[in-house]
Amino acid sequence: SITGISPITESLASLSTYNDQSITFALEDESYEIYVEDLKKDKKKDKVLLSYYESQHPSSESGDGVDGKMLMVTLSPTKDFWLQANNKEHSVELHKCEKPLPDQAFFVLHNRSFNCVSFECKTDPGVFIGVKDNHLALIKVDYSENLGSENILFKLSE
C-alpha cells in the first residue's frame, strides 16, 4: 500500500535510455505517443514530472508481514497525463486520468549502477519498463539473471 496519497517529493527530469536515446512525447490525433529516439543537438529534451511516494513492501515469503519500505514514482510528461502499464498488451501508454491515479500508473523505482534507474510495475512485480524496437514496452525480468539488462536501464537528468 502507498503510505500517503500525496507524494513525498516531486522533480522535473528528462528521461533517456542507457544508450543516451531520449524518451519523447508527441501529441498525435488527440492522444500522446511515446518515442525513443536520437535527438538533434539543438532540440530540447522533453521533461517528465516525477512524483515520489513512500510505500510498504510486503513480505514475499510469508505474504502477511511488511518487509520494509520502497520508493514508487508516477511519471507525467504533461498536465493530466501519466505513463501507465498495460500488462495485457505488454505496453507503456500515456493516459489522461484524474487522481487518485490507478495502480497501473505507479512504478517501483530501482537504484542501479552507472547512475541509472529502473521502473518496475506496481501491478506486475518482475515486469519493468524497457526499450523494445525503439518504443517503450513492458519487459519481464528474471531477478537472478538479467537485472543489469541495458534495455531496462534509464537515466534521469535535470
Partner: antibody
C-alpha cells in the same frame, strides 16, 4: 521474520585471510542488493562492499579493493566476504546488510561478526 | 568522497524535551530530486537500526517522535518528546554515491 546471521570472524595475523558468511532468511534473497558495513573499535561506520541482486554489479571502498571480494550464492541464501592481505586497520565488527527493495538505503542489519587483525 | 559532519558529538537532553542532531554534507546528496540522506540509531551491543530514509521518511516501525528534515547539504534529526529508550548513538549516512559514507556519530543521553 527477516533475519541476517553473520559468521566467520576471528583473530588473524597481518597478511592473513578470512571468509565471512551471512545467511539470510525471511525474504527473497535474490531480489535484494546486499552489502558489508564495518564498525571500527572507535565506533566509526564504514561501508565496505555491495553486490546487486542478480550478481550483476559489485562495488568496494578503495581501501579494500584488490584484497576483499564480495559474492553471493542465491541458492543458499548466503552472502560472502573473502578477505585477504588483512591489515590491522581491518579490525572491526563486520555487519551484513540488506538494502530496501529498490536499493536506496541499508534497511536490515545482522548482529555482526568480529574480525581482529593483530601480530 | 562525500564527507558527513555530525554535530554535536555528545548531547544530553531531559525526558520529554527535544533532541536535535545535525548532519552537514561536503556536497549535495540530492539525486533524481531525492535527498539521499539516511539516519540510524545504534544501542550498545546492537547493530544500527534504520530510523529515517531519504531525509524525512520513517523506516518500518519507527515511532512518530522521530522526524528528519533538510535538503541539499544540511539535514537534521529531531526526537520529541525524548524518551529513556532513545539513549543511543545516532549516525547519518549518504546513499547518493559510492563510497557510501557515514557521519562520525552523536551520542545522545538522558539528563
Amino acid at each position: 521474520d527477516v533475519n541476517l546471521v553473520e559468521s566467520g570472524g576471528g583473530s588473524v595475523k597481518p597478511g592473513g585471510s578470512l571468509k565471512l558468511s551471512c545467511v539470510a532468511s525471511g525474504f527473497t534473497f535474490s531480489s535484494f542488493s546486499m552489502s558489508w558495513v564495518r564498525q571500527t573499535p572507535e565506533k566509526r561506520l564504514e561501508w565496505v562492499a555491495t553486490i546487486s541482486g542478480g550478481k550483476t554489479f559489485t562495488d568496494y571502498v578503495d581501501s579494500v579493493k584488490g584484497r576483499f571480494t564480495i559474492s553471493r550464492d542465491d541458492a543458499k541464501n548466503t552472502l560472502y566476504l573473502q578477505m585477504s592481505s588483512l591489515e590491522s586497520e581491518d579490525t572491526a565488527m563486520y555487519y551484513c546488510t540488506r538494502a530496501n527493495y529498490g536499493n536506496w538505503f541499508f534497511e536490515v542489519w545482522g548482529a555482526g561478526t568480529t574480525v581482529a587483525v593483530s601480530s | 568522497d562525500i564527507v558527513l559532519t555530525q554535530s554535536p558529538g555528545f548531547l544530553v537532553v531531559s525526558l520529554g524535551q527535544r533532541a536535535t542532531i545535525s548532519c552537514r554534507a561536503s556536497e549535495s546528496v540530492a539525486k533524481y530530486g531525492l535527498s539521499l540522506l539516511n539516519w540510524f540509531q545504534q544501542k550498545p551491543g546492537q547493530p544500527p537500526k534504520l530510523l529515517i530514509f531519504a531525509a524525512s521518511n520513517r523506516g518500518s516501525g519507527v515511532p512518530a517522535r522521530f522526524s528528519g528534515s533538510g535538503s541539499g547539504t544540511d539535514f537534521s534529526l529531531n526526537i520529541h518528546p525524548m524518551e529513556e529508550d532513545d539513549t543511543a548513538m545516532y549516525f547519518c549516512q549518504q546513499s547518493k554515491e559510492v563510497p557510501f559514507t557515514f557521519g562520525s556519530g552523536t551520542k545522545l543521553e538522558i539528563k
